[in-house]
């Protein structure tokens, strides 16, 4: 949020040189007026009067929704996930029709043993959440299932999930190659047909903070950008202080317009300030520059 600048006069001068009396209204901002009943309110930029005040739409604020916020809330999900659709062939169980019925005793038992087996297989993968059988069919038992992966959101979440999916592929390939029937019997918890292992599809959560920031900034999309702090994304305009992209207005106030951020320079009793960053001070009495 912006700190207020203590000045002894109420005059603000744009960095281009023209003086604007406060409260500042950005003349380049599109103005629409909302009228509800008898109450005529100058709620601009799509804002509406709720009977007491203007309710502003993002990214606007102010009494008349005439100002543009310096930062927009973007909320990445706490966690992001991936779903892998896999098929394996279990040879240590003979298929029966009851396995097609998900509420049968047979399916429940198969599901329990299969889940236990997969939990062992994927035990070293921190992103692993579990498995979900979607279909069982003949041959011995062809198991169509989803492997679910989840991780905390970080800017590198896609890499983390991509790496986890690769480890899943390696581990399922290994177990279905090693745990095979010998002399028509299985000595493991479950045995598999090596050739029956397939990865059908991988779906990864899509979240792009830059896209969310641009969407919420609407016509200011070219001037808002995402910066990270403690691995959390912030959608900011250059008028938000404390970031790499922050604009330093020195003796002035940063304000957003549809042409980007600009500095409105202050005029005090002793000085007036100019320049793109309001860093050129002129003493009123002596008329010489100092920096």
């Amino acid at each position: 949020p912006l700190a207020t600048i203590p000045v002894s006069t109420t005059s603000l001068t744009s960095s281009e040189g023209s003086t604007i009396s406060t409260p500042s209204v950005d003349i380049s901002t599109p103005v629409t007026t909302s009228i509800v009943g008898d109450q005529c309110s100058r709620c601009k930029n799509g804002g509406f009067w709720d009977g007491l005040k203007c309710q502003c739409l993002t990214p606007y604020y102010g009494e008349s929704c005439e100002e543009v916020v310096n930062s927009i809330d973007i909320a990445p999900p706490e966690t992001v996930s991936a779903q892998m659709e896999l098929t394996v062939t279990v040879t240590s169980v003979k298929f029966t029709d009851e396995l097609k019925n998900h509420s049968s005793q047979e399916f429940r038992e198969f599901n329990k043993t299969f889940t236990e087996q997969m939990n062992i297989v994927y035990s070293g993968i921190p992103e692993y959440v579990g498995v979900n059988i979607t279909n069982l069919r003949l041959g011995s038992v062809v198991v169509e299932h989803d492997v679910l992966l989840r991780t905390k959101y970080t800017p590198e979440y896609k890499t983390a999930l991509d790496n986890a999916t690769e480890v899943v592929k390696q581990k399922i390939t290994k177990v279905t190659t090693e745990q095979i029937m010998t002399n028509d019997n299985c000595s493991a918890l479950m045995c598999f047909n090596t050739t029956g292992t397939q990865v059908q599809n991988i779906t990864v959560t899509q979240y792009d903070p830059v896209e969310e920031c641009r969407q919420k900034a609407e016509e200011y999309e070219d001037y808002f950008l995402v910066e990270y702090r403690d691995q959390k994304p912030y959608c900011i305009s250059p008028c938000e202080s404390g970031f790499n992209a922050s604009k330093n207005c020195n003796h002035g106030k940063c304000q957003m317009s549809q042409n980007g951020a600009r500095c409105l320079c202050v005029t005090t009793e002793t000085h007036w300030y100019s320049g793109e960053d309001c860093n050129q001070g002129t003493q009123k009495s002596h008329h010489h520059h100092h920096h």
Partner: nanobody, 124 residues
Framework: DVQLQASGGGSVQAGGSLRLSCAAS????????MAWFRQAPGKEREVVAF????????YYADSVKGRLTISHDNAKNTLYLQMDSLKPEDTAMYYC?????????????????WGQGTQVTVSS
């Protein structure tokens, strides 16, 4: 849930016979797997034999082939183990196990339902 009750254990001289029984209840189908496992002191639990109740499959461990016979009475839902020509190395606690699946695994962890053990002691 499936319940298993084993009985028939005892002490016998080498070369003698015993018949173990295991009564099963709680099955929703008449097609499932049942097995006999045994565990001697200080050793891991090992499979003796298993059977599919539809008659599709029987299996015997090499050490008991020709001496022990597994069978199942569908009408009584009871598993049997006929033990002939017993040897001192057959001494162990014998457990019956079951699965609602048609299993072909000798790993005890794959069998979800277990009865309490019945002791078989064969002396020389």
């Amino acid at each position: 849930d499936v319940q298993l009750q084993a009985s028939g254990g005892g002490s016998v001289q080498a070369g003698g016979s015993l018949r173990l029984s295991c009564a099963a209840s709680g099955y929703t189908s008449n097609r499932y797997s049942m097995a006999w496992f045994r565990q001697a002191p200080g050793k891991e639990r090992e499979v003796v034999a298993f059977i599919w109740t539809d008659g599709g499959r029987t299996y015997y461990a090499d050490s008991v082939k020709g001496r022990l016979t597994i069978s199942h009475d569908n009408a009584k839902n009871t598993l049997y183990l006929q033990m002939d020509s017993l040897k001192p190395e057959d001494t162990a606690m014998y457990y019956c196990a079951a699965s609602s699946l048609l299993l072909q695994t000798i790993n005890p962890r794959a069998w979800p339902y277990w009865g309490q053990g019945t002791q078989v002691t064969v002396s020389s």
